[in-house]
């Protein structure tokens, strides 16, 4: 048993049929010595008396809010949550496996630049009685500070009968230098509590590996005289690290016809303009990637050819 | 030692070209190592991230773009600060810092070159003959060092008397390649920045 926060405790249980469970001793936080009784949740049934209560925790029915009273007055509470371990593996029932970039990916994180700010998100099918708390640090043995906000529900997605909820959190490394060479990874820890079930999820990464720039901005076309060619120009996204001559991007320009079957023309360039042939009903798209460290491409910015 | 002249002249451009070749070569070599040594801990997640230049050179700090010198987090480990007379930079100071930057890059390359050559000598003794260092990568390191044009004492190749542990050598190769790739990214950024200014 360990304390998650004040008056909230997590009991770690090996979860298999007829498991013996864990013996837990609760102590009433009071100077009083006699006349103390214990109840669980909303029930008025007295579970025991005295300053301490010894219980055998085996299943979710044994978890919940234990309250000690004296003469009708509440003295203190202890909330017991369960953390299940099945076949030596901690349960991951609350969050959905996103399977990207690999199986058992519950948390995904992205950064728009090298400022030390990043966003993590996760999915669940659970809609109520759910709380998350997020902690993060740079390195684990001698951790350096990363500050995370509160996790918020950002989206609901419905696919037929299935509803999933997306939560996200923003974190900022306390003293980040965009030019630094990372040698210790960022660690992100998410505590998830659904009703009386506790689970924790972790992710470890270097900012350089989770970079995904915003799409290029101000995508414009300029037709070239007496030609089917156009000059496409764009700018670095506002959110990208500066100076741009140090934090350079490379770009992919794509011309795509209306039908998916039509051949796509692709050009790669380090410049912020390119000359392409604009076909009728086609669209021109541009995306960006760090020029020197191949992390993710941005989403596409697109304009119609016409 | 000859300090390079700090005027962004056409002489900077070959360095940019060589640094791009360097990044390409080390990235290819790392990819090859990850594929060939697939049953060894050779991915970014599996290895310890060591920097053989730590406490010996200060490339990131010495080559910091001017725009980032206002960032306290970038300055806290610097012995030499760009900032003089408030936020004004004297041109002599700028050229001195650029010389410091380029000489630091040169020292990095020299250190990695020695390590890689020593390692290759060990790998050539491996009866499995599983992996060797790409000669192109070693040549590119050499070309960039020549383009940087420093006169420096030659560091003798480390020789080891004991029997090499090939498993450890291959893991060390992965660690070195990961670290060198990160440093090659920094060098490329620096050359691009200097070329633009």
């Amino acid at each position: 048993i360990w304390e998650l926060k004040k008056d909230v405790y997590v009991v770690e249980l090996d979860w298999y049929p007829d498991a013996p469970g864990e013996m837990v001793v609760l102590t009433c936080d009071t100077p009083e010595e006699d006349g103390i009784t214990w109840t669980l949740d909303q029930s008025s049934e007295v579970l025991g008396s005295g300053k301490t209560l010894t219980i055998q925790v085996k299943e979710f029915g044994d978890a919940g809010q234990y309250t000690c009273h004296k003469g009708g007055e509440v003295l203190s509470h202890s909330l017991l949550l369960l953390h299940k371990k099945e076949d030596g593996i901690w349960s991951t029932d609350i969050l959905k496996d996103q399977k990207e970039p690999k199986n058992k990916t519950f948390l995904r994180c992205e950064a728009k630049n090298y400022s030390g700010r990043f966003t993590c998100w996760w999915l669940t099918t659970i809609s109520t009685d759910l709380t998350f708390s997020v902690k993060s640090s740079r390195g684990s043995s001698d951790p350096q500070g990363v500050t995370c906000g509160a996790a918020t529900l950002s989206a609901e997605r419905v696919r037929g009968d299935n509803k999933e909820y997306e939560y996200s959190v923003e974190c900022q490394e306390d003293s980040a230098c965009p030019a630094a060479e990372e040698s210790l990874p960022i660690e992100v820890m998410v505590d998830a509590v659904h009703k009386l079930k506790y689970e924790n999820y972790t992710s470890s990464f270097f900012i350089r590996d989770i970079i995904k720039p915003d799409p290029p901005k101000n995508l414009q076309l300029k037709p070239l005289k007496n030609s089917r060619q156009v000059e496409v120009s764009w700018e670095y996204p506002d959110t990208w690290s500066t100076p741009h001559s140090y934090f350079s991007l490379t770009f992919c320009v794509q011309v795509q016809g209306k039908s998916k079957r039509e051949k796509k023309d692709r050009v790669f360039t380090d410049k912020t303009s390119a000359t392409v042939i604009c076909r009728k009903n086609a669209s021109i798209s541009v995306r960006a990637q760090d020029r020197y460290y191949s992390s993710s491409w941005s989403e596409w910015a697109s304009v119609p050819c016409s | 030692r000859n300090l390079p002249v700090a005027t962004p002249d056409p002489g900077m451009f070959p360095c940019l070209h060589h640094s791009q070749n360097l990044l390409r070569a080390v990235s290819n070599m790392l990819q090859k190592a990850r594929q060939t040594l697939e049953f060894y801990p050779c991915t970014s997640e599996e290895i310890d991230h060591e920097d053989i230049t730590k406490d010996k050179t200060s490339t990131v700090e010495a080559c910091l773009p001017l725009e980032l010198t206002k960032n306290e987090s970038c300055l806290n480990s610097r012995e030499t600060s760009f900032i003089t007379n408030g936020s004004c930079l004297a041109s002599r100071k700028t050229s001195f810092m650029m010389a410091l930057c380029l000489s630091s890059i040169y020292e990095d390359l020299k250190m990695y070159q020695v390590e890689f050559k020593t390692m290759n000598a060990k790998l050539l003794m491996d009866p499995k003959r599983q992996i060797f260092l790409d000669q192109n990568m070693l040549a590119v390191i050499d070309e960039l060092m020549q383009a940087l044009n420093f006169n420096s004492e030659t560091v003798p190749q480390k020789s080891s008397l004991e029997e090499p542990d090939f498993y450890k050598t291959k893991i060390k190769l992965c660690i070195l390649l990961h670290a060198f790739r990160i440093r090659a990214v920094t060098i490329d950024r620096v050359m691009s920045y200097l070329n633009a200014s």
Epitope: T119, S168, Q256, S283, S285, E299 | -
Partner: nanobody, 117 residues
Framework: QVQLVESGGGLVQPGGSLRLSCAAS????????MGWYRQAPGKQREIVAT???????NIADSVKGRFIISRDFVKNTVALQMNSLKPEDTAVYYC???????????WGPGTQVTVSS
């Protein structure tokens, strides 16, 4: 091309809530991304929230924790639940969709949201 129709705009007091809805029609299979942008008088159109068929929802910092985007992949609808509204949320809200990652955006005609006491 996709046709988009918004509904649910109106006048609301500061601190109040509104729900905007948008339905897509036309020759569509699965739409890659749907979402909402807004344009306040004299300002540029800005992102509010967009949600792709997979990957991360993009929510503007200014509305994080107050607005929730909901998307139904079968009905091809998107909704925006706006809570704790502020006067600075006053704008014309536009529904937005892209059939594929590289296709050009389609826009609805817009719906006015006014937050005022």
């Amino acid at each position: 091309q996709v046709q988009l129709v918004e509904s649910g705009g109106g006048l609301v007091q500061p601190g109040g809530s509104l729900r905007l809805s948008c339905a897509a029609s036309g020759s569509i299979a699965e739409i890659y991304v749907m979402g909402w942008y807004r344009q306040a008088p004299g300002k540029q159109r800005e992102i509010v929230a967009t949600t792709p068929s997979s990957g991360r929802t993009n929510i503007a910092d200014s509305v994080k924790g107050r607005f929730i985007i909901s998307r139904d992949f079968v009905k091809n609808t998107v909704a925006l639940q706006m809570n704790s509204l502020k006067p600075e949320d006053t704008a014309v809200y536009y529904c937005y969709a892209r059939l594929t990652p590289t296709s050009v955006a389609s826009w609805g005609p817009g719906t006015q949201v006014t937050v005022s006491s």
